[in-house]
Interface confidence: low
């Protein structure tokens, strides 16, 4: 008799794939445009993408640290109108895009929520929660909440109003901490909290690094559903080499949990690249003329247009695993098991019941490696088998779909391999 | 205006324990983070810890997990640092200090110690 | 624990010239970095937070720059009371820390 099939947990819009975060709506557009009108008119790209969510904004009112003139209902007229929004939300419904909106107050100022009146900050958040909510909006993201004094009781009281108006909205919270204890202590009193935070941005050293930092996250969120970044706003390039990014690609991709990006990390964009563009929001490079100021600045491969012609660049591999992650159950809401493969690198499984299994490994050195996967590392329920197909690599040159014996698995420098195998009983 | 005002110098044998003082003006430590900071003779400044005295909620740095106990009495506006088993290197100046900002002072990561008290010196000698 | 580490226990200026202390975190701290003064006897005195901002009654000569893991701390006309010694410290990640500190004097 077949083993009965494992039920199904309940998924969450949130939970099928990735975030895309446009915090600056002029950066991402370009050429002086830069409104809601305009942004309709890039739904289709975010659509190729296979994203689920678009984090937007702030797009409110805000003069520079001054609470009075901070407006959370009211659309700033540079981007557009009410109007504008509105329509951009019907157009994103129908592509199956969710719209959360960053209500973080103060963005234009020194701290995001002021340093004093903190209530009348918080009630101003309030009543936009209801307002926007009422406009259709799927979900908030407020950032920089270490600047909000008893941070943990309004986003529990924020959480209400969401989770209230309906289950399938989403509050994003938003911090620029590192340090677990802070980040759990947020967490703890508040359950369905989508957290970002930093405290995956110092991992780029080593394997073993990155994968005690993960092992250590999961174990103390234990059953929570979580989220995958590098921090709360900011680009991979801010943070990694260009050599790592596809290996950070496949991670946060196949992690247990929503990844998060921030638009341009799909095509590697870096501000250091750009002279005179501002670390936290350049341009995103369309094509080669998204940035005039420096004739010859931009080649081709830092596009999306030339991206999008060339099956090798980072720009396919980020469709690729998106689309991986968007249907496959073991990746969706597989259980994840992190094993030793060798020092410097990182490799775990993702699985499912009776689906197809998954097996990721990540060589973060930059030499070449043999991985020595230990497989006694492993629950029965997760064993490895002699061989697995490699689905994808994120170095040019492998030959895709053929299957790898696991006991010889040789890793190029910043390789990650994602190879897949069935389930046998 | 804002003070921190600290407990008078100790003189102390080793293996013995000491519990210093300080007392806030000028704002309520409900409001912030109390630090505390330490200077050997001669040396640079060590970060010990610091308390959120609205949950008693405490950081310490590693190194001094065990040798410091940082606590507060939010009726007397006043935050404690208890230094236990003494010995010759704990003889320094030990100052509390908080972060400028007293009315949304949660910013752990963003602001600077504005407000320091004078200072309290601990030798310890037998 | 992040550390931070000033390369110059000391350096020797004259009275209005220009100077520069340097700061390196051994990881990111994005703009996490404050610079205190302290004169002996005397209790710090921040002077930066948040690598660039200048606090509360802090002369305009002293100003703050870097992010990620360089700062620097420049007095650009050096006056007698500036002789002092400089520590910067990161505010990202408890625990705090501080540089091991810079003694400005007088060539």
């Known amino acids: 008799r077949a083993p009965r099939c494992r039920e199904l947990p309940a998924q969450k819009w949130w939970h099928t794939g990735a975030l895309y975060r446009i915090g600056d709506l002029q950066a991402f557009q370009g050429h002086g445009a830069g409104n809601l009108a305009g942004l309709k008119g890039r739904l289709d790209y975010l659509s190729s993408l296979k994203v689920k969510g678009l984090v937007l904004g702030p797009i409110h009112k805000n003069q520079k640290d001054d609470v009075a003139q901070t407006d959370l209902l009211q659309i700033d007229p540079n981007f557009g109108s009410k109007e504008d929004f509105d329509s951009l939300l019907q157009s994103a419904k129908k592509k199956s895009i969710r719209v959360i909106l960053d209500l973080t107050p103060n963005y234009r100022g020194e701290n995001s929520w002021f340093s004093t009146q903190v209530d009348t900050v918080a009630t101003k958040v309030k009543d936009a929660l209801e307002f926007w909510l009422q406009a259709g909006v799927d979900g908030f993201q407020v950032r920089d909440i270490e600047n909000l004094k008893d941070a943990s009781s309004f986003l529990a009281e924020w959480q209400n109003i969401t989770k209230g108006f309906s289950e399938d909205r989403l509050l994003i919270a938003g911090t620029n901490s590192s340090d677990l204890q802070q980040i759990l202590s947020l967490l703890e009193s508040n359950k369905d909290l989508l957290l970002t935070s930093s405290y995956l941005s110092d991992s780029g050293s080593t394997g073993e690094h990155t994968k005690s930092l993960v092992t250590q996250y999961l174990n103390a969120t234990g059953n929570r559903w979580c989220s995958w970044s590098l921090s709360q706003a900011r680009l991979l390039t801010s943070f990694l080499p260009a050599q790592l990014l596809r290996l950070y690609q496949l991670m946060l991709f196949t992690l247990p949990g929503t990844p998060v990006f921030s638009y341009g990390d799909e095509i590697g964009l870096d501000a250091a690249a750009l002279p005179g563009q501002p670390m936290e929001a350049p341009v995103m490079l369309w094509d080669e003329s998204s940035f005039p100021d420096i004739p010859g600045a931009v080649s081709a491969n830092m596009t999306v247009k030339g991206q999008s012609e060339d099956p090798g660049s980072l720009l396919s591999l980020f469709r690729r695993l998106s689309d991986q992650r968007s249907k496959e159950r073991s990746l969706l809401h597989g259980d994840f098991h992190a094993f030793s493969a060798g020092p410097g690198l990182f490799s775990y499984i993702r699985h499912w019941d009776q689906n197809e299994r998954f097996l990721v490994v990540l060589n973060f050195g930059d030499v070449g490696l043999s991985a020595g996967l230990q497989a006694s590392d492993l629950p029965a329920s997760a064993s490895l088998p002699a061989k697995a197909d490699l689905l994808l690599s994120t170095q040019p040159g492998r030959e895709e779909g053929s299957p790898l014996e696991l006991e010889r698995l040789k890793l190029e420098p910043h390789e990650g391999l994602l190879l897949r195998f069935p389930y046998a009983a | 205006e804002v003070q921190l005002l600290q407990s008078g110098a100790e003189l102390v044998k080793p293996g013995a324990s000491v519990k210093l003082s300080c007392t806030a003006s000028g704002f309520n430590i409900l409001d912030t983070y109390i630090h505390w900071v330490m200077q050997r003779p001669e040396q640079g400044l060590e970060w010990i810890g610091r308390?959120?005295?609205?949950?008693?909620?405490?950081k310490y740095d590693p190194k001094f997990q065990g040798k410091a106990t940082i606590t507060a009495d939010t009726s007397s506006n006043t935050a404690y640092l208890q230094l236990s088993s003494l010995t010759s290197e704990d003889t320094a100046v030990y100052y509390c200090a908080s972060p400028f900002t007293t009315v949304v002072a949660t910013n752990i990561y963003y602001y600077g110690l504005g407000y320091w008290g004078h200072g309290t010196s601990v030798t310890v000698s037998s | 624990d992040i550390v931070m580490t000033q390369s110059h226990k000391f350096m020797s200026t004259s009275l209005g010239d220009r100077v520069s202390i340097t700061c390196k975190a051994s990881q990111g701290v994005f703009t996490a970095v404050a610079w205190y003064q302290q004169k002996p006897g005397q209790s710090p005195k921040l002077l930066i937070y948040s690598a660039s901002y200048r606090y509360t009654g802090v002369p305009d000569r002293f100003t703050g720059s870097g992010s990620g893991t360089d700062f620097t701390f420049t007095i650009s006309s050096v006056q007698a009371e500036d002789l002092a010694v400089y520590y910067c410290q990161q505010h990202y990640s408890t625990p705090w820390t501080f540089g091991g500190g810079t003694k400005l004097e007088i060539k």
């Open positions: 308390i959120d005295p609205a949950n008693g909620h405490v």
